[in-house]
C-alpha cells in the first residue's frame, strides 16, 4: 500500500492494486470528503510523456482502466497524486512519487476451471488471460478442493503449482462416490534465485475462481498412498 499524508489531521492511506494488464483498483481509508468535492487520483507515467490516467473516487474506491496501448509492462512507474476541490480550489497532494505496478499485483482469478474424470484420477484445467501468457512461469496457483457438502474452511489445499494450467488429483485424494468441488486462485511469484529484489513482482492472491463440481473417480486396486505404508 502507498500512503499520502493529508494536511492537518486527515491522513490518507491508499492501496492501489493492478491486475497486471489494464486495470488498477484503488481503495483509501480516509473519511468521506464533503459533498461535491469529487476527489480523484492522477497516475502520471514517469516514463511515457503525456501518459496520465484519472481515477475518480466514488466513496472510498476508484478504478482506472488503461487504454489498450498502455497495457502495463514490467518497467512501468507512475507518480500518484490526490486531487480534490476545497472552497472552489483544487488541492493536490503527493501520494506516491514512484508507484511500481509490478509490486502491487492482484491478478484476476483463473477462468474456465474444468474437470475431466478418468479411471483413477481427475484432471483439472483452467485458463489465464492471453495477456499474461508471457509471464506463465511467474504464475503460482493454489487449489482448494472438498466434498460438495463441506464448507470451504474444511477444504484440502494444494499449492506451489507453478507455470502450468493443469493439475491431476489422484483418486486416493478424494472420497469415492461423493461429488467434490474445486476452486483456484493465482498470484505472481518470482521464484528464480537469481532475480534481484528490485526486479521482483509482488502482490497478493487473486480472488478464488468460480468452483467446478465433479464426481470423484473410483479408486483402482488397493489403496496405497504414493509414499507407501508407514
Amino acid at each position: 500500500s502507498v500512503t499520502g499524508e493529508g494536511q492537518g489531521p486527515r491522513s490518507r492511506t491508499f492501496t492501489c492494486l493492478t491486475n497486471n494488464i489494464l486495470r488498477i483498483d484503488c481503495h483509501w481509508s480516509a473519511p468521506e470528503l464533503g459533498q461535491g468535492s469529487s476527489p480523484w487520483l492522477l497516475f502520471t507515467s514517469n516514463q511515457a510523456p503525456g501518459g496520465t490516467h484519472k481515477c475518480i473516487l466514488r466513496g472510498s474506491e476508484c478504478t482506472v482502466v488503461l487504454p489498450p496501448e498502455a497495457v502495463l509492462v514490467p518497467s512501468d512507474n507512475f507518480t500518484i497524486t490526490f486531487h480534490h476541490c476545497m472552497s472552489g480550489r483544487e488541492q493536490v497532494s503527493l501520494v506516491d512519487p514512484e508507484y511500481l505496478p509490478r509490486r502491487h499485483v492482484k491478478l484476476d482469478p483463473p477462468s474456465d476451471l474444468q474437470s475431466n474424470i478418468s479411471s483413477g484420477h481427475c484432471i483439472l484445467t483452467w485458463s489465464i488471460s492471453p495477456a499474461l501468457e508471457p509471464m506463465t512461469t511467474l504464475l503460482s496457483y493454489e487449489l482448494a478442493f472438498k466434498k460438495q457438502e463441506e464448507a470451504w474452511e474444511q477444504a484440502q489445499h494444494r499449492d506451489h503449482i507453478v507455470g502450468v494450467t493443469w493439475l491431476i488429483l489422484e483418486a486416493f485424494e478424494l472420497d469415492p462416490g461423493f461429488i467434490h468441488e474445486a476452486r483456484l486462485r493465482v498470484q505472481m511469484a518470482t521464484l528464480e534465485d537469481d532475480v534481484v529484489e528490485e526486479e521482483r513482482y509482488t502482490g497478493q492472491w487473486s480472488e478464488w475462481s468460480q468452483p467446478v463440481c465433479f464426481q470423484a473417480p473410483q479408486r483402482q486396486g488397493p489403496l496405497i498412498p504414493p509414499w507407501g505404508w508407514p
Partner: nanobody, 125 residues
Framework: QVQLVESGGGLVQAGGSLRLSCAAS????????MGWFRQAPGKEREFVAA????????YYADSVKGRFTISRDNAKNTVYLQMNSLKPEDTAVYYC??????????????????WGQGTQVTVSS
C-alpha cells in the same frame, strides 16, 4: 526502462545478405514481444517482422516472407533479423521495438512501448 540499440546495418549489393542485431539493456527482455520496422525516405514506417516473447511465434510482412528471418536469444537480451536476397526496395532505416502484445497485433506500431534509434540499410543495384 528498456533501451534498444540496433547494429549490423550497412551498404550491400542487391542479392546480398545482412544480419541486424538489437541489444536490449534493462530487465524483462523475455517478457516482451519484439518487432522490426523500417522507414524508407519519404515513406511511413512499416512493419517487417516480429517474434513472441519466448520465440515460439513469428510474423512477417508479405514483402519479406521467405527472405527475412527473425530470431531472439533471451540469454543475450538480443533479437536478430537475418536478411537474405536483399532488394533495392529494402533500403530503409530499420528500427527495433519492444512491447507487451495484448490488444493490437504485432504488426501495429502502437503495440510497442520501446523503440531503438534505428540502423541504416542501403541496398544498391
Amino acid at each position: 526502462q528498456v533501451q534498444l540499440v540496433e547494429s549490423g546495418g550497412g551498404l550491400v549489393q542487391a542479392g546480398g545478405s545482412l544480419r541486424l542485431s538489437c541489444a536490449a539493456s534493462g530487465r524483462w527482455f523475455r517478457f516482451y514481444g519484439m518487432g522490426w520496422f523500417r522507414q524508407a525516405p519519404g515513406k511511413e514506417r512499416e512493419f517487417v517482422a516480429a517474434i513472441s516473447n519466448e520465440g515460439g511465434s513469428t510474423y512477417y510482412a508479405d514483402s519479406v516472407k521467405g527472405r527475412f528471418t527473425i530470431s531472439r536469444d533471451n540469454a543475450k537480451n538480443t533479437v536478430y533479423l537475418q536478411m537474405n536476397s536483399l532488394k533495392p526496395e529494402d533500403t530503409a532505416v530499420y528500427y527495433c521495438a519492444a512491447g507487451r502484445w495484448y490488444y493490437y497485433g504485432p504488426e501495429y506500431q502502437i503495440t510497442y512501448r520501446y523503440w531503438g534509434q534505428g540502423t541504416q540499410v542501403t541496398v544498391s543495384s
